[in-house]
């Protein structure tokens, strides 16, 4: 089943997020992803947990998952590199790098996104954009076209309250508000973009969507710059 989750958002402007990727299993959307280099897509490690026997591919240049679009192209995956410390039972280190079978054909609808290398927290209250093909309501309706929502960054202390995530948010994670607007099932691995720069990746833990006391959790890419560099090099 798709992992992670856009609730309370709206349809994105077609092809305005040329870095957006759909990680697919056996031809169906599984998770979001973000093109970070010509031949590399960053996603969440948990996305591939149940994909052992399936065919993993990456769709780039898409707005609609089903309709033909000139910019759409499905790439095979040459190599999948989950972070060595990712584990099924935790949200920590939930990153995955997928090497495409060839360099992506770049254009207006396919373009890597610069990612944050400076390891500093995004200021609380900063509005960040999260996009994905995850479910759009509690009934589990899956959209065909890319959705997005603007979410304010939530400070770690609040996110770690006992009533919220109870200390689970380490320095390598960040939170965004989840009051009716939220990332949801199927959005995992997708990008949290602040000021045009990739700051976070939607984690793929199973949490309730749209509940303000259970903020969205995102892996801070800046905290993993050394690992990302070492794989991409």
């Amino acid at each position: 089943p798709p992992r992670g989750r856009i609730l309370g958002g709206r349809e994105a402007e077609a092809h305005a997020r040329p870095y957006m990727a759909s990680v697919q299993l056996n031809g169906a959307h599984l998770c979001g992803g973000v093109l970070v280099a010509e031949q590399w897509v960053l996603s969440a490690a948990h996305c591939l947990e149940d994909a052992a026997d399936g065919k993993v591919q990456v769709l780039l240049g898409a707005h609609s998952l089903s309709q033909p679009e000139p910019s759409k192209r499905l790439y095979d995956v040459l190599r999948a590199v989950p972070h060595p410390d990712s584990q099924p039972d935790t949200i920590d280190h939930d990153l995955l790098l997928l090497q495409l079978s060839e360099k992506a054909t770049l254009g207006p609808a396919v373009r890597p996104l610069p990612w944050q290398r400076v390891d500093r927290d995004v200021a609380p209250g900063t509005l960040c954009d999260v996009a994905g093909w995850g479910i759009v309501n509690h009934a589990g309706r899956r959209p065909d076209s890319l959705q997005h929502v603007l979410l304010p960054v939530l400070d770690r202390a609040t996110c770690n309250r006992r009533t919220h995530h109870d200390g689970a948010i380490t320095e390598r994670l960040m939170c965004a508000e989840s009051n009716r607007r939220d990332s949801c099932k199927g959005d995992s691995g997708g990008p949290l973009v602040c000021g045009g720069v990739l700051e976070g990746v939607v984690t793929s833990g199973s949490r309730v969507c749209g509940n303000r006391k259970k903020p969205g959790i995102y892996t801070r890419v800046a905290s993993y710059a050394a690992w990302i560099d070492s794989v991409l090099a």
Epitope: V81, A225, A226, W227, D229
Partner: antibody, heavy 122, light 107 residues
């Protein structure tokens, strides 16, 4: 086999600059990122930074950002490090190193040069 | 910056003994830790990476372990060729940082 051959010892005056080299052999030069590490006599190791020879992308330890300049010459399969405005603090052995590692993730180093000794003295 | 603390600058052991060299990270580094051996006048040699994985050709007398942010290199059946300096390194975050080193000596 894979080797990193470093240039010979340097004696320099305070305020001067030195440029040392690290010549790679036994592999395609653009395949591996070259890192530089400093070791002062009887001390630990300090990471200076790296250069990716295929893209010339550099990444510096901020403690060395104004001190070291990393470059690479693909035609001679050689990486260079220039140290400027030398003081006695720069008297050290400087190593170049790469990660061949079959798993291709993580910046640990399994091939090292023999080191270049820099002595700064008036 | 992440500080890697090797609390023992020197460790004395006897040939044939088992010795543990420790290294503590100042914050979470996952398992992104390597260990190196350095003999006088030589460059460092990689022993262990990703906390547990022995580098090619390293004898199985050398093992790496971890408890949280505490990392240990254990050498069993110490031989004369093991007398050297040992350094830990974290590569979880930039800047990459090394421990101050532990010199293994004979009692």
């Amino acid at each position: 086999q894979v080797q990193l051959q470093q240039s010979g010892a340097e004696l320099a005056r305070p305020g001067a600059s030195v440029k040392m080299s690290c010549k790679a052999s036994g592999y395609t030069f653009t395949t591996y990122t070259i890192h530089w590490v400093k070791q002062r006599p009887g001390q630990g190791l300090e990471w200076i930074g790296y250069i990716n020879p295929s893209s010339d992308f550099t990444n510096y330890n901020q403690n060395f950002a104004d001190k070291a300049t990393l470059t690479a010459d693909r035609s001679s399969s050689t990486a260079y490090m220039q140290l400027s405005s030398l003081t006695s603090e720069e008297s050290a052995v400087y190593y170049c190193a790469i990660r061949l590692g079959y798993d291709r993730q993580g910046w640990y180093f399994d091939v090292w040069g023999a080191g270049t000794t820099v002595t700064v003295s008036s | 910056d992440i500080v890697m603390t090797q609390s023992h600058k020197f460790l004395s052991t006897s040939l044939g003994d088992r010795v543990s060299i420790t290294c503590k990270a100042s914050q979470d580094v996952g398992s992104a830790v390597a260990w190196y051996q350095q003999k006088p006048g030589q460059s460092p040699d990689l022993l262990i990476y990703w906390t547990f994985t022995r580098h090619t050709g390293v004898p199985d007398r050398f093992t790496g372990s971890r408890s949280g942010t505490d990392f240990t290199l254990t050498i069993s059946n110490v031989q004369s060729g093991d007398l050297a300096d040992y350094f830990c390194q974290q590569y979880s975050n930039y800047p990459l940082t090394f421990g101050g080193g532990t010199k293994l000596e004979i009692k």
